[in-house]
C-alpha cells in the first residue's frame, strides 16, 4: 500500500530515533565530563557533539548558563540542569501539545511528529480536510481542530456511512402544513394553497390574499376569497381593459347614422312635456291662425302644437292619439275633442296644416282636409288694443290634466319647413341651427334610441296577488328586450331599491367573464352583484337580438336569440339569490331602462349606460318611454337611427 509522503515519514521517524538512542546517551555522559564538571571551550564542545550545527546551537547557550548560574566550579545545581537540557531540543517541548504525537531531538534542531489532522513545524496548524474533495462529504464538510465531520442541509439526514445524505419526507408528518397541501421537495417541503391564497406558517392554514392592498385595480377593487375583481366607473363611460385591472373608454363598436338635420325641429326634447318652442304673436290688425309644417313620427301619442290664450280662454291643441290626429279646442270655456284622418305615425314625412277661417278650423294632411270644425270666435284675443296669440310646439303652456281630454304630451316627432302665420320665421331657424339637441336625426327607424348617456325609469309592481284570498302573493319578472347595440357594455334593464340603494336585478351587456377573467361578449343576468346566468352574444354585428329573462319563485332563465344561457350558481345559491330578489320586490323598487342611477360600481356587474336601439317588454307589457316616470332627454322614445351602411 502506498502512503502519501508526509504520512510515510511520520511512520518511519520513530524507528530512526531508536537507532540514535545509544549515541545520544553516550553523548550526554561525555558532555557531563567535559562541560558540566569542567569549563569547556568551543573546540571541546565540538569534540562532544562531533558536528558544527549542534555546537553552534549549544555553545552560545552554554555561555548564557554560565552568565546565569556561574561557572561549573561554583557547583550550582541550576547550572548543571541548564547545560544538560541544552542539547535536547525537545526540552522544553517546542511542539504544540494538542497536535503533537512526539518531539524528536535533532542535531541542533527538533522535529514535531504530528497527530492526524494537524500539521506545521510545531504541529499547531489544523489540517483542513474539507479543502480537498469536500473531505469526502456529499453535502456539508465541517472542519474541526484536528478533525472534520460531514453533515447535511436542512431537510436531509446523514446516512450511516457518515458521508452521504438522504432526503427527509416532511410530508409524512400530517401536521407539517396543517390545512394546506404538503408537497415534499428535495431537502425541503412546501405548503401549497390555491391561487389567491397564501400560506400562513403561524396558523398553518391558507389565508386569502387581499389583492386590493397591492393596488392592482385602476379604480375600484373588490377582494373575494381567492380572487379579486376590478370595477370601472361605467356611468363615466369606462369599462375594464383586456388586462382586467385597468379601465378604458366604452367606445361604439357599431356606427349608427346619428347625423342630424339643421333644418329640422325635434319635438321630443323636453321630457317634462313642456314645449320645445314658445312663440308669441301680437298684432294691431286682427289676424287668423295659419300653421303649416312637414311632420314625421313613429310615436302614437303626443302634442304637436297649441295655439291660443291662457288655459281658461280660447285655444286649440293639435295632437296625436293612437296614431291619428286629434284636435282639442276650448272656445269661451266650452271644450270639444275631434279625431279624424288616417294613421300618420308611420315614420314618413307628411304636410300638416291648421287654418283658421271665418267660422271654421280646417286641418289638412298632405293638402287633404281631414277635419273641418265649426268654431265661434277667434284664437287671437284682443287685450289693451292688441291681438295676442301664444303658439307652442311639442307641448302646452299648462298642465295636461287641464286639457279637454288628458293626453300624454310627449311626442317623439320631427318637424321641418314650418310656417307660422304665413310669416318668415328666422328666429326658430337660428336657434335650432346652433342647438343640435333641437334637431332631429336625419333618418330614423322604429324603436327607442339610448345614446349611452342616460336612463329612463318606471314605477312598476312585480308582486301578484292570486284571486283566491288568503294565499301568499307571488312574484314574476319577465323581460323581453329587442336590442340593436352600438356598444359592447351597458345596462339593458335593472331594478333599483332606492331605500337600500341596492340593485336587486340587472340584465346587461358585458365584454368579460368576471370570475374567469376572460374577455368575452356576454349578456349577464344578476341579482345584486352576483351573476346568475351568462349567455354569449354577437353584440357588434349590427343585427337585432332578442334577450329574454324570466324569473319567478324557484327559477331564473336567460335566453339570447332563443338559446338558453349558462347558470353561474348552484341550485342552493340560486334559491338564496331569488329569495333576496323577492325580499326587494316586496318593498318599493324602480324599473330602470338603459342604465342605473348613481350607485356604487360594485352594486351590479355593469353600471354603464346602454348605447343602441332597444324596446322593452316587461311582464308582457311593452314599455312606452313617454310613459316613464323619468327619461333622459337624449333618449328618443319612438325612433332610432339606423346602422350606418358599410363603406364600399
Amino acid at each position: 500500500a502506498l502512503l502519501p509522503a508526509r504520512e510515510a515519514t511520520q511512520f518511519l521517524r520513530p524507528r530512526q530515533r531508536r537507532a540514535f538512542q545509544v549515541f545520544e546517551e553516550a553523548k550526554q555522559g561525555h558532555l557531563e565530563r567535559e562541560c558540566v564538571e569542567e569549563l569547556c571551550s568551543r573546540e571541546e564542545a565540538r569534540e562532544v557533539f562531533e558536528n558544527d550545527p549542534e555546537t553552534d546551537y549549544f555553545y552560545p547557550r552554554y555561555l548564557d548558563c554560565i552568565n546565569k548560574y556561574g561557572s561549573p566550579y561554583t557547583k550550582n545545581s541550576g547550572f548543571a540542569t541548564c547545560v544538560q537540557n541544552l542539547p535536547d531540543q525537545c526540552t522544553p517541548n517546542p511542539c504544540d501539545r494538542k497536535g503533537t504525537q512526539a518531539c524528536q531531538d535533532l542535531m541542533g534542531n527538533f522535529f514535531c511528529l504530528c497527530k492526524a489532522g494537524w500539521g506545521g513545524r510545531l504541529c499547531d496548524k489544523d489540517v483542513n480536510e474539507c479543502s480537498q474533495e469536500n473531505g469526502g462529504c456529499l453535502q456539508i464538510c465541517h472542519n474541526k481542530p484536528g478533525s472534520f465531520h460531514c453533515s447535511c442541509h436542512s431537510g436531509f439526514e446523514l446516512s450511516s456511512d457518515g458521508r452521504t445524505c438522504q432526503d427527509i419526507d416532511e410530508c409524512a408528518d400530517s401536521e407539517a402544513c396543517g390545512e394546506a397541501r404538503c408537497k415534499n421537495l428535495p431537502g425541503s417541503y412546501s405548503c401549497l394553497c390555491d391561487e389567491g391564497f397564501a400560506y400562513s406558517s403561524q396558523e398553518k392554514a391558507c389565508r386569502d390574499v387581499d389583492e386590493c392592498l397591492q393596488g392592482r385595480c385602476e379604480q375600484v377593487c373588490v377582494n373575494s376569497p381567492g380572487s379579486y375583481t376590478c370595477h370601472c366607473d361605467g356611468r363615466g363611460g369606462l369599462k375594464l381593459s383586456q388586462d382586467m385591472d385597468t379601465c378604458e373608454d366604452i367606445l361604439p363598436c357599431v356606427p349608427f347614422s346619428v347625423a342630424k338635420s339643421v333644418k329640422s325641429l325635434y319635438l321630443g326634447r323636453m321630457f317634462s312635456g313642456t314645449p320645445v318652442i314658445r312663440l308669441r304673436f301680437k298684432r294691431l290688425q286682427p289676424t287668423r291662425l295659419v300653421a303649416e309644417f312637414d311632420f314625421r313620427t313613429f310615436d302614437p301619442e303626443g302634442i304637436l302644437l297649441f295655439a291660443g290664450g291662457h288655459q281658461d280662454s280660447t285655444w286649440i291643441v293639435l295632437a296625436l292619439r293612437a296614431g291619428r290626429l286629434e284636435l282639442q279646442l276650448r272656445y269661451n270655456g266650452v271644450g270639444r275633442v275631434t279625431s279624424s284622418g288616417p294613421v300618420i305615425n308611420h315614420g314618413m314625412w307628411q304636410t300638416i296644416s291648421v287654418e283658421e277661417l271665418a267660422r271654421n278650423l280646417v286641418i289638412k294632411v298632405n293638402r287633404d282636409a281631414v277635419m273641418k270644425i265649426a268654431v265661434a270666435g277667434d284664437l287671437f284675443q284682443p287685450e289693451r288694443g292688441l291681438y295676442h296669440l301664444n303658439l307652442t310646439v311639442g307641448g302646452i303652456p299648462f298642465h295636461e290634466k287641464d286639457l279637454v281630454q288628458p293626453i300624454n304630451p310627449r311626442l317623439d316627432g320631427c318637424m321641418r319647413s314650418w310656417n307660422w302665420l304665413n310669416g318668415e320665421d328666422t328666429t326658430i331657424q337660428e336657434t335650432v341651427k346652433v342647438n343640435t339637441r333641437m334637431q332631429c336625426f336625419s333618418v330614423t327607424e322604429r324603436g327607442s334610441f339610448y345614446p349611452g348617456s342616460g336612463f329612463a325609469f318606471y314605477s312598476l309592481d312585480y308582486m301578484r296577488t292570486p284571486l283566491d284570498v288568503g294565499t301568499e302573493s307571488t312574484w314574476e319578472v319577465e323581460v323581453v328586450a329587442h336590442i340593436r347595440p352600438a356598444a359592447d357594455t351597458g345596462v339593458l334593464f335593472a331594478l333599483w331599491a332606492p331605500d337600500l340603494r341596492a340593485v336587486p336585478l340587472s340584465v346587461a351587456l358585458v365584454d368579460y367573464h368576471s370570475t374567469k377573467k376572460l374577455k368575452k361578449q356576454l349578456v349577464v343576468l344578476a341579482v345584486e352583484h352576483t351573476a346568475l346566468a351568462l349567455m354569449e352574444i354577437k353584440v357588434c354585428d349590427g343585427q337585432e337580438h332578442v334577450v329574454t329573462v324570466s324569473l319567478r319563485d324557484g327559477e331564473a332563465t336567460l335566453e339570447v336569440d332563443g338559446t338558453r344561457g349558462q347558470s353561474e350558481v348552484s341550485a342552493a345559491q340560486l334559491q338564496e339569490r331569488l329569495a333576496v330578489l323577492e325580499r326587494h320586490l316586496r318593498s318599493p323598487v324602480l324599473t330602470f331602462a338603459g342604465g342605473l342611477p348613481d350607485v356604487p360600481v360594485t352594486s351590479a356587474p355593469v353600471t354603464a349606460f346602454y348605447r343602441g336601439c332597444m324596446t322593452l317588454e316587461v311582464n308582457r307589457r311593452l314599455l312606452d318611454l313617454d310613459e316613464a316616470a323619468y327619461k333622459h332627454s337624449d333618449i328618443t322614445a319612438h325612433s332610432c337611427p339606423p346602422v350606418e351602411p358599410a363603406a364600399a
Epitope: 301680437k282 292688441l386 304665413n422
Partner: antibody, heavy 116, light 107 residues
Framework: QIHLVQSGPELKKPGASVKISCKAS????????MNWVKQAPGQGLKWMGW????????TYTEEFKGRFVFSLDTSVTTAYLQISTLKAEDTATYFC?????????WGQGTLITVSS | ETTLTQSPSSLSVSTGDRVTITCITS??????MNWYQQKPGKPPKLLIS???TLRPGVPSRFSSSGSGTDFTLTISSTQPEDFADYYC?????????FGQGTKVEIK
C-alpha cells in the same frame, strides 16, 4: 325677402299737402297692418298710428288726429300717408313699419321738409 | 297711455366698455319691452323683442333684462359699430310708445 320701399324726400311750403308712399313686397300685404312713425330732426321716435290692410280702417294717436290720413291701394300693395296744411313742426322723417305687435321691418324713411 | 323714461339721454364710452341703458315705464307692462338701435340716416333696427328675446343676427354682447316697470339694455363690451342711438318701445298697450332715446358716443 320682405321689403318696404318709401317714396323720396319732399320739400314743401307751410299750408301745402304731401302724400308719401310705402310699397310692400315679399309677403301677403293684407296679412299685416301698416304703421307710421315720425322722427323729427335730432329727436326721438313717435308712433303715429296704423292702418288695417284688410279693411282699410285707420287708427291715429291723439297727436296725429286731423291733418293726417292713412290710406291703401291693395292692388299695388302700397300704403300712403297724407299730411295736409303742412306746418314747420311737420318737418321730419316718416317711416312705415309692418305690424307685428312690434316693428321688425321698416321702410327706409321719407324726409319731409316744410319751409317757407 | 304708458310713458317711458329712458336714461341716460347720452353717454360717452370707449370701445370695450360695458354700457347699461334703462327704461322705466309708468305702468306694469309685464315683459312687453323691445329695444332698437338706430344709426344716422337709417331706420331703427330691432335688437331685442318682447320677453327679452335676442333677435336673429344680433350679437350676443347685447342683452336685456327686466319685467314690470324696470328694464335694462346692456352692451357687455362696446364695439365701434355699436355707437348709435338706442330706443325702448313698449308693446303692451295702445298707443305704442317709445323712450326718448340714448345716444352712445365715442369718448
Amino acid at each position: 325677402q320682405i321689403h318696404l320701399v318709401q317714396s323720396g324726400p319732399e320739400l314743401k311750403k307751410p299750408g301745402a299737402s304731401v302724400k308719401i308712399s310705402c310699397k310692400a313686397s315679399g309677403y301677403t300685404f293684407t296679412n299685416y297692418g301698416m304703421n307710421w312713425v315720425k322722427q323729427a330732426p335730432g329727436q326721438g321716435l313717435k308712433w303715429m298710428g296704423w292702418i288695417n290692410t284688410n279693411t282699410g280702417e285707420p287708427t291715429y294717436t291723439e297727436e296725429f288726429k286731423g291733418r293726417f290720413v292713412f290710406s291703401l291701394d291693395t292692388s299695388v300693395t302700397t300704403a300712403y300717408l297724407q299730411i295736409s296744411t303742412l306746418k314747420a313742426e311737420d318737418t321730419a322723417t316718416y317711416f312705415c313699419a309692418r305690424d307685428e305687435g312690434w316693428f321688425v321691418y321698416w321702410g327706409q324713411g321719407t324726409l319731409i321738409t316744410v319751409s317757407s | 297711455e304708458t310713458t317711458l323714461t329712458q336714461s341716460p339721454s347720452s353717454l360717452s364710452v370707449s370701445t370695450g366698455d360695458r354700457v347699461t341703458i334703462t327704461c322705466i315705464t309708468s305702468t306694469d307692462i309685464d315683459d312687453d319691452m323691445n329695444w332698437y338701435q338706430q344709426k344716422p340716416g337709417k331706420p331703427p333696427k330691432l335688437l331685442i323683442s318682447e320677453g327679452n328675446t335676442l333677435r336673429p343676427g344680433v350679437p350676443s354682447r347685447f342683452s336685456s333684462s327686466g319685467s314690470g316697470t324696470d328694464f335694462t339694455l346692456t352692451i357687455s363690451s362696446t364695439q365701434p359699430e355699436d355707437f348709435a342711438d338706442y330706443y325702448c318701445l313698449q308693446t303692451d298697450s295702445v298707443p305704442l310708445t317709445f323712450g326718448q332715446g340714448t345716444k352712445v358716443e365715442i369718448k
